[in-house]
């Protein structure tokens, strides 16, 4: 560092900034000798409102430094991000935001539940708000899934009105026929592949709606659609395997007692879905009377044996292997209760009986020419078989 | 030697959003410094909208917060303005630059204009 | 924010002549944290003066600059025809970093 040229003057002796310590410390500094500035942790080295990494100035011959002192300034992570559908709080003091301060972030209750972590942020010396995990991204509010106001009643024939709350996860599709959807998050909807075949060139022409009791109720949640997913394994008017879609909201909607996705269904769900187990179908689909029902209605029926309703749809007019493992079947053998043309996309549903949330076993699919026929069943798209298929649209869009 | 070079589309139609990209080469941009974006409306007056440092941190001009994002992609040495919901009075000429008062490091890439009209 | 006010907005100087231009903050500048800039029409702007008086690199020794607080000037000792161009000031003394409206040196 030291270059004597004893015809220069000396530049001004340097004073390290506070929090901060200067290097190396001479007696004098002459031309092109150097020092270099270092903060203290949890302090930066600042040159106005500019940061820098590193700071050394150099002595000119006119014994000026070549540039002006830093300051080190504690570091400031600045205002948290906002938590969608989630507050934040300060923990050290109202709005401290400098190294060392403490948030946390915690979800809306009820209806949110806060993944990834725990939600306590520290402001570190890098000047990014880091949880415990050394995540730097906020944490993010998932809806809960699966919570639904109904009591499991007793079954009327043909099926019921569905109150307030009951199906809050029921989605009407209309923009080509009347269908059905189960939301899933906040801003995706699962529905059947044929039910929104027509459209999947154009998705803004689905008219969603959400939180609808009444199929005709101007009291309702808006939704429009961003994307349309088809599972590529589907082809119209070719059976009906793979009879599975997905659709991508253009926004997320707001989750409350009349909006909660349902759930899907976790490794350990089949134990839920034997033969004879109970599901839910809802929709606003053709009752008896031969009309779309006015009402969202809802019908209990039982899982039916898988070989006994693939029996049942080889003889004629149904041609053999119309029935596959992607489907599973759900009835009354002697008829009379089953989902029927506009209830397409709805979602079966299930209780699990360890975490107490409705999860979705089966799409609406197809059935027999005549619902609720005997001797014939309601077939859904088996959505355990697809779920590597839904998490990876969802994760990559 | 450090060269800074923006590329964008040109014309953005009302209510859009414009996404610029400044391409550095001769310097890696989590080495030192702050990286900013300055725009010049037509009538010659410059802006300061913001800037992403070395570490990843970024400010942003008040005025322009709300509708901000700064971001960069270390890998391509390259840094990226977002400004949503734009009007015609976002019709400019944007400069990606470096400012600093280290002798001889400050920079600016030649500016790309960019019209808001439908 | 701290504005900057140039002045004058355009003038025009002949070869040789003596030229100053001030740039007036509505609050106090640290003298380190004022830059000056020159641009020409079709260029970016390039760093003409930094810590208020301290020369870029490649300006000519004609150039000078002053000031502390809130008053600041550039000048030119003798005018040149290569000075012909628009100056701005900059503070980055605090955020926002703000820009004079600049000052248009022309040639008589």
């Known amino acids: 560092h030291h270059h004597h040229h004893h015809a220069s003057q000396p530049c001004p002796y340097p004073m390290a900034p506070p929090n901060g310590h200067l290097s190396p410390v001479q007696a004098k500094y002459i031309l092109k000798d150097s020092f270099s500035i270092f903060c203290e942790p949890g302090y930066e080295l600042l040159q106005g409102h500019l940061p820098l990494k590193s700071f050394a100035a150099v002595c000119q011959k006119d014994g000026s430094w070549d540039q002006p002192m830093p300051s080190c300034s504690i570091v400031d992570c600045g205002p948290p991000d906002d938590l969608p559908s989630g507050r934040v709080e300060y923990i050290t003091g109202p709005e401290v935001t400098t190294y060392k301060a403490v948030i946390q972030y915690s979800c809306e209750e009820t209806f949110y539940t806060m993944k990834v972590n725990d939600g306590k942020y520290v402001c570190e010396a890098d000047g990014f708000w880091t949880s415990s995990k050394g995540e730097r991204s906020p944490p993010v509010c998932e809806p809960v899934c699966g919570l639904s106001a109904r009591t499991t009643g007793g079954r009327i024939y043909g099926g019921q009105k569905a109150k307030p709350g009951d199906f809050p996860w029921q989605v009407l599709i209309l923009g080509g026929s009347t269908a059905a959807g189960a939301l899933l998050y906040d801003n995706w909807v699962l529905t059947a592949a044929h039910a929104i075949y027509e459209q999947k060139h154009d998705a803004s022409s689905l008219d969603i709606r959400l939180g609808a009791l009444k199929r005709l109720s101007p009291h309702y949640t808006q939704a429009w659609a961003e994307a349309v997913f088809i599972h590529e394994g589907y082809t119209h008017d070719a059976g009906f395997d793979n009879d599975i879609a997905l659709i991508k909201l253009n926004n997320k909607v707001v989750i409350n007692s009349n909006i909660t996705p349902i759930c899907l269904p976790r490794k350990e769900a089949e134990s839920f879905m034997r033969t004879d187990d109970i599901g839910t179908a809802s929709g606003w689909g053709l009752t008896q009377r031969g009309l779309l029902a006015r009402n969202l209605m809802y019908v209990d029926i039982p899982i039916v044996d898988h070989q006994k309703c693939t029996a049942a749809y080889e003889k004629p007019p149904y041609s053999g292997g119309s029935v596959t493992a992607n489907m599973l079947c759900a009835g009354l053998e002697s008829g009379g209760k089953d989902s029927c043309r506009g209830d397409a996309g709805g979602a079966l549903v299930f209780l699990d009986n360890e975490t107490q949330r409705w999860f979705v076993g089966g799409i609406v699919s197809w059935g027999s020419m005549n619902c609720g026929e005997a001797g014939q069943y309601g077939v859904y798209t088996k959505v355990i078989n697809y779920i590597p298929w839904i998490k990876n649209i969802i994760s990559n869009f | 030697d450090v060269q800074l070079q923006e590329s964008g589309p040109g014309l953005v139609r009302p209510s859009q959003s414009l996404s610029l990209t400044c391409t550095v080469t001769?310097?890696?941009?989590?080495?030192?410094?702050?990286w900013n974006w300055i725009r010049q409306f037509p009538g010659n007056k410059l802006e300061w909208m913001g800037y992403i440092s070395y570490s990843g941190r970024t400010s942003y001009n008040p005025s322009l917060k709300s509708r901000l994002s700064i971001t960069r992609d270390t890998s391509k040495n390259q840094f990226f303005l977002q400004l949503n919901s734009v009007s015609s009075a976002d019709t400019a000429t944007y400069y990606c630059?470096?400012?600093?008062?280290?002798?001889?490091?400050?920079?600016w890439g030649q500016g790309t204009t960019l019209t808001v009209s439908s | 924010q701290t504005v900057l006010t140039q002045s004058p907005a355009i003038m025009s100087a002949s070869l040789g002549e003596r030229v100053t231009m001030t740039c007036t903050a509505s609050s106090s500048v640290s003298s380190s944290y004022l830059l000056w800039y020159q641009q020409k029409p079709g260029s970016s702007p390039k760093l003409w003066i930094y810590?208020?008086?301290k020369l870029a690199s490649g300006v000519p020794v004609r150039f000078s600059g002053s000031g502390s607080g809130t008053s600041y000037s550039l000048t030119i000792s003798s005018m040149e025809a290569d000075d012909a161009a628009t100056y701005y000031c900059?503070?980055?003394?605090?955020?926002?970093?703000?820009f004079g409206a600049g000052t248009k040196l022309e040639l008589k």
């Open positions: 630059a470096i400012i600093s008062t280290a002798v001889d490091f400050d920079y």
């Open positions: 900059l503070q980055y003394n605090r955020s926002p970093l703000t």
């Open positions: 810590s208020t008086s």
């Open positions: 001769g310097y890696s941009i989590t080495s030192d410094y702050a």
